[in-house]
Amino acid sequence: ERLCHPCPWEWTFFQGNCYFMSNSQRNWHDSITACQEVGAQLVVIKSAEEQNFLQLQSSRSNRFTWMGLSDLNHEGTWQWVDGSPLLPSFKQYWNKGEPNNVGEEDCAEFSGNGWNDDKCNLAKFWICKKSAASCSG
């Protein structure tokens, strides 16, 4: 009997998507490339449930982890790598006092119990996201 695996080996399934939490570190741009190489995208967050799930994964492992959010195109205008803007209800996830753009901090990371902006050239862990395979039929 063939079992259906909605996600590749070492990926985590959550609400119809597959997530890969890296075990190595890269800068923000290279993290984007790493996700593209496996047919995925540096994680773009669409719901509060998804945010809570990812924040928990990141804080559990006590890692600073890149997400697909930056204000590289226009300072102060935060945009996801899929081109969509940071929506009002997601701004609550910034840690207190963030984003503060201290010394050109233009890329967003999971940090502790919320988000932080940091320098994009720093090496950090990253999370990729792609749609899960359909197991119907």
Partner: antibody, heavy 119, light 112 residues
Framework: QVTLRESGPALVKPTQTLTLTCTFS??????????VSWIRQPPGKALEWLAL???????YYSTSLKTRLTISKDTSKNQVVLTMTNMDPVDTATYYC???????????WGQGTMVTVSS | QSVLTQPPSVSGAPGQRVTISCTGS?????????VHWYQQLPGTAPKLLIY???NRPSGVPDRFSGSKSGTSASLAITGLQAEDEADYYC???????????FGGGTKLTVLG
């Protein structure tokens, strides 16, 4: 109790600029998580989202109308203003302002103001 | 043509159950964005009926329920009453359009 009220001209001529004001009470647009949006509804047709401004003064616009719209707020007066340039008869609609709190639901609406575009 | 597709009309007799579907795509409902539902009684402004897929604001009867799966969502109304006759709209966010979007609306007629 949250209330919103729209005001503006009932009739505008083609090519003119429409200015609508939303006056609200029961919440503050300086409170984190609060936003105010403009939504319109042509007679007998569906709702169409136009623009939104949040407590942070970040502005969001409908892609198809972006070049014609400007949204702004006056926190001290509890008002949000929408301007729409180059009005056309197809812009005839009831214009609503609505509050959006967290999770992107429009949880309180004004009664709407009907705007007719005609020469 | 609305980004979220709803049936133009549905009908049912008092006491019956009706459902209204809202079909989207991978850039809105299927992407994981929340779905909300509004009721618009004739000649009045819309009113929030269901928020975040399945939650009822206080004051909304438990005859109204919402669900979401994949790229679609649905609103169910049980024990239909004459006062439920109204237009119903679904709403979500669309990342391709970078904006909030509504369905085309569904007119509910309560028969008899």
């Amino acid at each position: 109790q949250v209330t919103l009220r729209e005001s503006g001209p009932a009739l505008v001529k083609p090519t003119q600029t429409l200015t609508l004001t939303c006056t609200f009470s029961g919440f503050s647009l300086s409170t984190s998580g609060m936003s105010v949006s403009w939504i319109r509804q042509p007679p007998g047709k569906a709702l169409e989202w136009l623009a939104l401004i949040d407590w942070d003064d970040d502005k969001y616009y409908s892609t198809s109308l972006k070049t014609r719209l400007t949204i702004s707020k006056d926190t001290s007066k509890n008002q949000v203003v929408l301007t729409m340039t180059n009005m056309d008869p197809v812009d005839t609609a009831t214009y609503y302002c609505a509050r959006m709190a967290l999770r992107h639901a429009f949880d309180a609406w004004g009664q709407g103001t009907m705007v007719t575009v005609s020469s | 043509q609305s980004v979220l597709t709803q049936p133009p009309s549905v009908s049912g007799a008092p006491g019956q159950r009706v459902t209204i579907s809202c079909t989207g795509s991978s850039s809105n409902i299927g992407a994981g964005y929340d779905v909300h539902w509004y009721q618009q009684l004739p000649g009045t402004a819309p009113k929030l009926l269901i928020y975040v897929n399945s939650n009822r604001p206080s004051g909304v009867p438990d005859r109204f329920s919402g669900s979401k799966s994949g790229t679609s969502a649905s609103l169910a109304i049980t024990g239909l009453q004459a006062e439920d006759e109204a237009d119903y709209y679904c709403q979500s966010y669309d990342s391709s359009l970078s904006g909030w979007v509504f369905g085309g609306g569904t007119k509910l007629t309560v028969l008899g």
